[in-house]
Structure formats: C-alpha cells, structure tokens
Interface confidence: medium
C-alpha cells in the first residue's frame, strides 16, 4: 500500500504497483528555501545538495536551545516529500537547499530576497535544466518579495509556494499573492480543506490549486531512517513542486504558463467541500486538487484555459477591477460578477500592449470582480471588436468580420446605472455563431481570434423560470473560452467559468419574482484547436 | 564593539566619497513610496529594502547607498549597508533609523522602500 497522499496525486494507471512513475523528475533541479536539513537522511541522501547559503535571523528568547534535529525538522520533511526515495513525489529529482528559516522556522523578507538572488546568480553562472523553486514560507503581503518572484519567474524559473496556514485570504500574504508563483493550499485524505488548530489552509483567488497537506509521512530529522507525519500548506506545496519536477522532466521545454495550465487541467475537479471556506471566498477559490498527468506526453494537443479572478473593485461608484493573464497567455474572454448585482458590465481593453479584462461597479453596488479566461493559444492573433449601444429594439450586436477569425468571447458594458428588468429580453438570432448580442443600451465587445486550426462554437442553456444558477458545459474535446449571460438584465449577478462549465448567477429567486424577464440564458463559447491536435499526432 | 567600529569606518568612507550635500532631486513627477507589513507583530523596523528603478546599474545602486550613508551621517545618524542587490532587483538592504525614510525616499533612482518583515515556515 502507498500513503494516501501519494495515492491521491497518482493517476490510476500508475497505481498497479508501488508508486514509481516514469522519469521521476531526474532532469530537474528543485531549490528549497527553508530551514537547515539533515542531508544524510536515507530518504534524501545523495539527492540534496546543501548550498553554503544561509541568511536567518537570531532565534527569539534568551533560553532558546538549538537542537539540530529540531532545526532541521521542517526542511528535511519537505525535501523528503519532494524527492524522498520512498515517500517522495519526484524520486529522481535532485535538490539544493538554502537556509532562510532559523531553528524556530522564522526568517525575513530580506533574507528570502537574498536567497532568490543567489538562485538567479547560480542560474546565470551555471545554466542547468529546468529549475523549480519551493518557497514553503509566508509573511505579510510584500511588494518587494512579489516583485523578486516575478523577476525570477520571468527568467524561466518555476516558483511554487505555500498558500499559508492562517485560514485567511492568500492574497494578504507573500509570496502567495505573487501572480507568477504557483500558490498551493492544503487538503486532507477526505479532500477537505486542512484545519490546523484554530486556523487552517488559506484560500481565495490567489490560490492556484490544492494538494495533500495533512498527515503527510516524510523524513524526520530525529534520525537517518526516522519518519514523521507533518501537516500544512508547505507539505501541499512540496507535492506540487514534485509534480512540477515530474512534468518538466518529461517535457523540459514547458513554460511556466504551460506548466500552470497543465497542473490545473490534470487536477481532480470539484472534490473539495467548499462549505469550509467563508461564503464570499467560495466562488473565488479553485476547487482543484493536484495530480500527476495520466501520461507524460500527449497533452500538447489540448487547448488549455484557466479562469483568473481580479481583486475586488471596492464599492465606490466608478470603481473598476482588472483581471490579467500571464505574459504567455491570451485573454479569450472577459466577464464580471457582483454579489449585489449592481454592476455596469465589463470590457476588454489594451494595457501595456496586452489585453486586460476590466469590470465596472455601479452606483449603490458593493463592488465587482473582473473574470478573465486565459488560454494557451500559440501563434494567436486576437483583437476586440466593439459595437456601441444600438438603442434599437433588436439590441446591440457585433461579430468577427475578419477572414479566419473566430469568436472566443463576448462582453457587454453599459454606462446607464440600471439596464432595467422591465425591458424585453433580447433574442439571439440563430445560425450566427460569430456574433455577440446584448442589450440595446449596452456596448458589446467581441473577442475575435485567428490561430491555426482554431474552431469555436456557441452553446446555450436557457431556463424560462428564474433560477439562482444556470450552467452550460463544453463537451469532451472542447474547451470553454467564453462565458456570458443573455440577456444582460440587472438581476443577473454575473457570469464566470469554472473549469469547462459556464456559470451564470442570478439574484435570489424570492427577490426577483417569477416573471418572463426572469428568464436567464447561459452562453458558452467552446473551442478546440485542430492544429494542436495534428501537431501532437505528428509527434507521436 | 567590533561591529560598531566597522560601522564608523564605513561611515567615514561614505562621507569622504560624496560631494557635500549635492543630492540629485528625484526625477520630476515620480514619488517613491514606502511600504510596510500590515501585520504589526511581523514588522522589523530598522531594516529597509530600498528598491531602485528597473534599469539601475549595480554601480548606481552602490552610489545611491553611499549617498544615503553620507546624508544620514551629516544628520548624525549611523547606517549600515547590509547587502546590495543586483541580478533580480536593483537596490540595497540598509539598517537605519526610521527617521531617515523621508530622506531615503528622495534619493535618485529610488522606486520604493519596504520595511523588512518576518516570514514563517508553513
């Protein structure tokens, strides 16, 4: 039998025998910034190189006694989880440890920065294969720590960090809040979020995914063959660092954006009980538990997309919220969401040479979120086509008129405070898939893309009676790129993508009344890339 | 005691290497900002990361650090440059009194300053 955590991240095809997936991360070097470690532990002996880097604060308290085994405890366990020969995820990965946490597990932002700089300099002096940096630590939000992580990520390094053990929004902590970092929350054997005393795993939009983080068996620094069970988001992050090492070993050319999309794609979906999270965080927190891909190759044909939520706009009348994709990703659609339902829609706009998704709050609104659908689409050429408010009874419409461009997403934005629930719903003309249709008082924005072999289709699901939630999903082999609601009446709180499903949320049924304008239609745009599929077949 | 002597030695060198009081004003219209940890118990006042603008060279970082030391010395403050950053972010880590923040924010090339803070094993 294998420990629950290794079983959880292992696809069934690997489970027949003891956990021994191919490659084991042997082409990858994992840097660990943590406490000192016991490098002669059987689990990690010969796999972990202890660098001469050390930058730690003095231990607190005059009566503190340094005990080697306690000083090494956290780092040794994590090194074992990543690459331990028996209880590790990536048994072939080699590691390098930097000491940035003292014997009490405490460090400084400045010490961590100097450690990250050390890694960058090592990378420049002696370029090796893919690098993964594991940061199993957290402090308060730090602009400088996030900036350093961004720079290192842009130098081609994959950074994985703990979401934090504060049962709080991960966006309030660093490096968890750095968008370029893969931020990992912790779940237990029952796929529940981990509780740690009165606290527990962090959550929210800054978490990329969850991984096993409770009762994880790993190397103990008590002796060279001892094991101990530890819990926390550090352990969860170590699993993802191991999975990343495995994936990069199989496909060393993967970019950070490709790796993140694959981690999300191969995760177990919708297994976490969201009731554990505060209500306002549930929609923002990804319901994903990390897993290894079922095979090391052959994922290249897939069109990968993920959902990126913005920070909350705040309640002021003109407040806006912006969601951005990573540098290597394409923004294929933009939607918005407001718990109060008071919003003025969203639009895609250029910012610094890249498209971003901006959502607008309305007067009396408690604030909005912008939701970007960010996809990997090589050789894509995307643009936004806008139609101003038509004022015509048929509503506003816009389509992709350029040859070879397909519709990947629709957004609508209005200046009026209330589109009004008493106006008749807009009916969408059938047989025109390349067209966005919206309220006559709204401007409509179509995201139109050209990419080799890209094909898209529109899928709708309408419910005549008012419903709090309407969903429509893309079928197997197709990827959700756009998610919006028809019509854009004010009782719609917004639309957003959850994995391959478009979700349209409406106000509580009891407050809207069951009239004809209560009808809500969820509109999904589903795409696939024949070019990527062909390219992958040719490789095989 | 040894450490203090080192500080004074550094200070004297800094004074000697700077023209008296000729601090360049920061570029017009850009104001450097100060950041600190929102969680009070995690703050580490007295140590600051001075982050310089993106294209700043190592030599400029070192010059800016020395200038800060010189200007601080003229006001009777002791400072210690703990590390000069280059490779990821341009800047330096300095041990100094919080009284000098206003002065430091006006130095040329400064983008922002962040007070050091604690991080913890998770």
């Amino acid at each position: 039998s294998i420990p629950w955590n290794l079983e959880r991240i292992t696809p069934p095809r690997y489970r027949a025998d003891e956990y021994q997936p191919p490659d084991g991360g042997s082409l990858v070097e994992v840097y660990l910034l943590d406490t000192s470690i016991q490098s002669d532990h059987r689990e990690i002996e010969g796999r972990v190189m202890v660098t001469d880097f050390e930058n730690v604060p003095e231990e607190d308290g005059t009566r503190f006694h340094r005990q080697a085994s306690k000083c090494d405890s956290h780092g040794t366990h994590l090194a074992g989880v990543v690459s331990g020969r028996d209880a590790g995820v990536a048994k072939g990965a080699s590691m390098r440890s930097l000491r940035v946490l003292n014997c009490q597990g405490k460090g400084t932002v400045s010490g961590t920065l100097i450690g990250l700089e050390f890694i960058r300099k090592s990378q420049l002096v002696q370029p090796v294969g893919p690098l993964v940096v594991l940061l199993p630590l957290a402090g308060g939000y730090s602009r400088v720590l996030n900036a350093a992580c961004q720079r290192l990520a842009r130098a081609g390094v994959v950074l994985v960090t703990a979401a934090g053990n504060f049962r709080d929004d991960a966006c309030l902590y660093s490096p968890a809040s750095a968008p370029e970092v893969i931020t990992v929350g912790a779940t237990n054997a029952q796929d529940q979020p981990v509780t740690l005393g009165t606290l527990g795993t962090n959550f929210g939009r800054c978490v990329d995914l969850f991984a096993p983080g409770e009762d994880i068996i790993g190397a103990s620094s008590d002796c060279s063959t001892c094991f101990v069970s530890q819990s926390g988001t550090s352990q969860a992050a170590a699993h993802v660092a191991g999975i990343a090492a495995m994936m990069l070993s199989a496909e060393p050319e993967l970019t950070l954006a490709e790796l993140r999309q694959r981690l999300i794609h191969f995760s177990a979906k919708d297994v976490i009980n969201e009731a554990w999270f505060p209500e306002d965080q549930r929609v923002l927190t990804p319901n994903l538990v990390a897993a290894l891909p079922p095979s090391t190759h052959g994922a290249g044909w897939q069109l990968f997309c993920r959902t990126v939520w913005s920070a909350h706009s705040g309640p002021t009348r003109m407040a806006t919220a912006v969601a951005r994709c990573a540098p290597d990703e394409e923004l294929l659609s933009c939607s918005s969401f407001s718990r109060s339902g008071k919003r003025r829609g969203e639009r895609m706009e250029a910012q610094g040479g890249k498209l971003v998704c901006r959502a607008h709050n309305a007067f009396g609104g408690e604030g909005v979120y912008a939701i970007a659908r960010c996809c990997l689409l090589p050789q894509a050429n995307c643009s936004v086509h806008t139609a101003p408010p038509a004022e015509a009874s048929m509503g506003t419409r816009v389509h992709c008129h350029q040859q070879g461009h397909v519709l990947t997403g629709c957004s609508s934005h209005w200046e009026v405070e209330d589109l009004g629930t008493h106006k008749p719903p807009v009916l969408r003309p059938r047989g025109q898939p390349n067209q966005c249709v919206g309220h006559r008082e709204a401007s409509i924005h179509a995201s139109c893309c050209h990419a080799p072999g890209l094909e898209c289709k529109v899928k709708e699901h309408g419910i005549p009676a008012p419903q709090e939630q309407v969903t429509v999903a893309c079928e197997e082999g197709w990827t959700l790129t756009g998610c919006s609601a028809l019509p854009g009446t004010s009782h719609v709180l917004g639309a957003y993508a959850v994995d391959n499903t478009c979700v349209v949320r409406s106000r509580d049924v009891s407050t809207t009344g069951s009239t004809s304008e209560g009808a809500v239609t969820a509109v999904a745009i589903c795409c696939r890339s024949r070019h990527l599929a062909q390219a992958s077949q040719e490789l095989q | 005691q040894e450490d203090e002597d080192g500080d004074y030695e550094e200070l004297v060198l800094a004074l000697r290497s700077e023209e008296d009081g000729l601090a360049e004003a920061p570029e017009h219209g850009t104001t450097a900002t100060f950041h600190r940890c929102a969680k009070d118990p995690w703050r580490l006042p007295g140590t600051y990361v001075v982050v310089l603008k993106e294209e700043t060279h190592l030599s400029q970082s070192e010059r800016t650090a020395r200038r800060l030391q010189a200007q601080a010395a003229r006001r009777g403050y002791l400072t210690k440059i703990l590390h000069v950053f280059h490779g990821l972010l341009p800047g330096f880590l300095v041990k100094m009194s919080g009284d000098l923040l206003e002065l430091a924010l006006k130095l040329p090339h400064v983008d922002y300053i962040e007070e050091d803070s604690s991080v913890f094993a998770q």
Partner: antibody
Framework: EVQLLESGGGLVQPGGSLRLSCKAS????????MHWVRQAPGKGLEWIGR????????KYNEKFKGKATISRDNSKNTLYLQMNSLRAEDTAVYYC??????????????WGQGTLVTVSS | DIQMTQSPSSLSASVGDRVTITCRAS??????LTWYQQKPGKAPKLLIY???SLQSGVPSRFSGSGSGTDFTLTISSLQPEDFATYYC???????????FGGGTKVEIK
C-alpha cells in the same frame, strides 16, 4: 519475486579473511538499503552493518568497524561482506537482508537463506 | 547504547493458547520496533513493523503494541506452525545502528 542468495561461506583459518556475496533479484537493487546480520550457533541475531547501494554510503556496528567492509556492485545486483582477522567467535551463519519501506518505517523484509562461516584450525 | 531486553527468554505453551512476549528498550525508540520470527535452520521472517503494523501475508492472530520503551507481541491463538524463536529489533538513534533483543523461544508444552 524478491530473492536474496548468499554464497562464499565455508571453513576459514583463524586470522584469515573471506568475502561473502549476496545476489539480489526481483526488485530494483539500488532502491533499497542492504544489511548484513549474523547468528552464532545457538545465539541471537547480531547486526553487522548496512550499505545504501544508491550512494555507496555505509554504517557499521561499532564492534565490526575495521573488521567488516560492506560493498556492492549495482551492475551485478550484488552485495558483498569482506571479513578480516577472523577468530573462532566469528563462526556464525551470515545473512543479508533487504531494508524495505513500510508507510513511515523500515524493516528487514526479505532475508537470504544464510551462509555458514566456520573459523577453525 | 540501547539495550533490548526480551522476556521471557523461553516459554512453553499449547496450541490454542494466547501468548504474550514483551520487549523493553533501555531508551525511547518511539514506534520504530520490529518483530521477527525464526524457525530452526531458517532465516528470520518479518512479522510486524512500526510496533503494530502487520506485514502482508502474516496471519491476523499476530499483533503488536507499544510505543517508547515497552512493546508486546501477542499471538491470540497459538498454532503448530508458530513454534519458533521471536526477536524484537529497534533502531539506535545515537549509533545509527540496529539492535536485536535476545529472542524468546516458544516451545510446545
């Protein structure tokens, strides 16, 4: 099926030396530590030392330091025990054993059949 | 150094009896204690690891308990094939070494 096969035992003169072999099959040799344990006639088990075939690192019982040398040849999946300056009290059955991992602990899970070494003039 | 003391050194019992063997460590060995069974002329066989976990293929009449310094091996209903010598073994942190108990011989009454 995991198998460990010892060889090299026999009669040795006091002061002499010998090399025992343990051929492993049925698993990845370099992934498991290997131990040597001996048992004098009518007595209990006594640990001699172990080797990590992956790194070649060894650890010995204080009593056998300088007397026993454990080595391995990963290409042959074979473990060795070299014993020097043998005396009558080294007469024993010598076992090799694999150190298996079991959810947070280790144990000598597979043992060879043993090879008898008799030290006598 | 850790010493492992087994008691009794030998015992006589009948088929169907409940048999208990104890093993005491001179220092705390946590749960890192293993039990082996050895029959005459044969190599030892792993019974229990981590103080209480039964090795696969070992009959469920064998059980182990204990932690720290005091451990017990119990055979709930002795079978003819159980007549053998039983050894406990622990890991000595301080020496990075392995220590066996003196053994307990279970004989037919």
């Amino acid at each position: 099926e995991v198998q460990l096969l010892e060889s090299g035992g026999g009669l040795v003169q006091p002061g002499g030396s010998l090399r025992l072999s343990c051929k492993a099959s049925g698993y990845t040799f370099s992934s498991y530590w290997m131990h040597w344990v001996r048992q004098a006639p009518g007595k209990g088990l006594e640990w001699i030392g172990r080797i990590d075939p992956y790194t070649g690192g060894t650890k010995y019982n204080e009593k056998f330091k300088g007397k026993a040398t454990i080595s391995r040849d990963n290409s042959k999946n074979t473990l060795y025990l070299q014993m020097n300056s043998l005396r009558a009290e080294d007469t024993a059955v010598y076992y090799c054993a694999r150190y298996g991992y079991y959810l947070g602990s280790y144990a000598m899970d597979y043992w060879g059949q043993g090879t008898l070494v008799t030290v006598s003039s | 150094d850790i010493q492992m003391t087994q008691s009794p050194s030998s015992l006589s019992a009948s088929v169907g009896d409940r048999v208990t063997i104890t093993c005491r460590a001179s220092q705390d060995v946590s749960r890192y204690l293993t039990w082996y069974q050895q029959k005459p002329g044969k190599a030892p066989k792993l019974l229990i690891y981590a103080a209480s976990s039964l090795q696969s293929g070992v009959p469920s009449r064998f059980s182990g308990s204990g932690s720290g310094t005091d451990f017990t091996l119990t055979i709930s209903s002795l079978q003819p094939e159980d007549f053998a010598t039983y050894y406990c073994q622990a890991y000595d942190y301080s020496l990075s070494g392995y220590v066996f108990g003196g053994g307990t011989k279970v004989e037919i009454k």
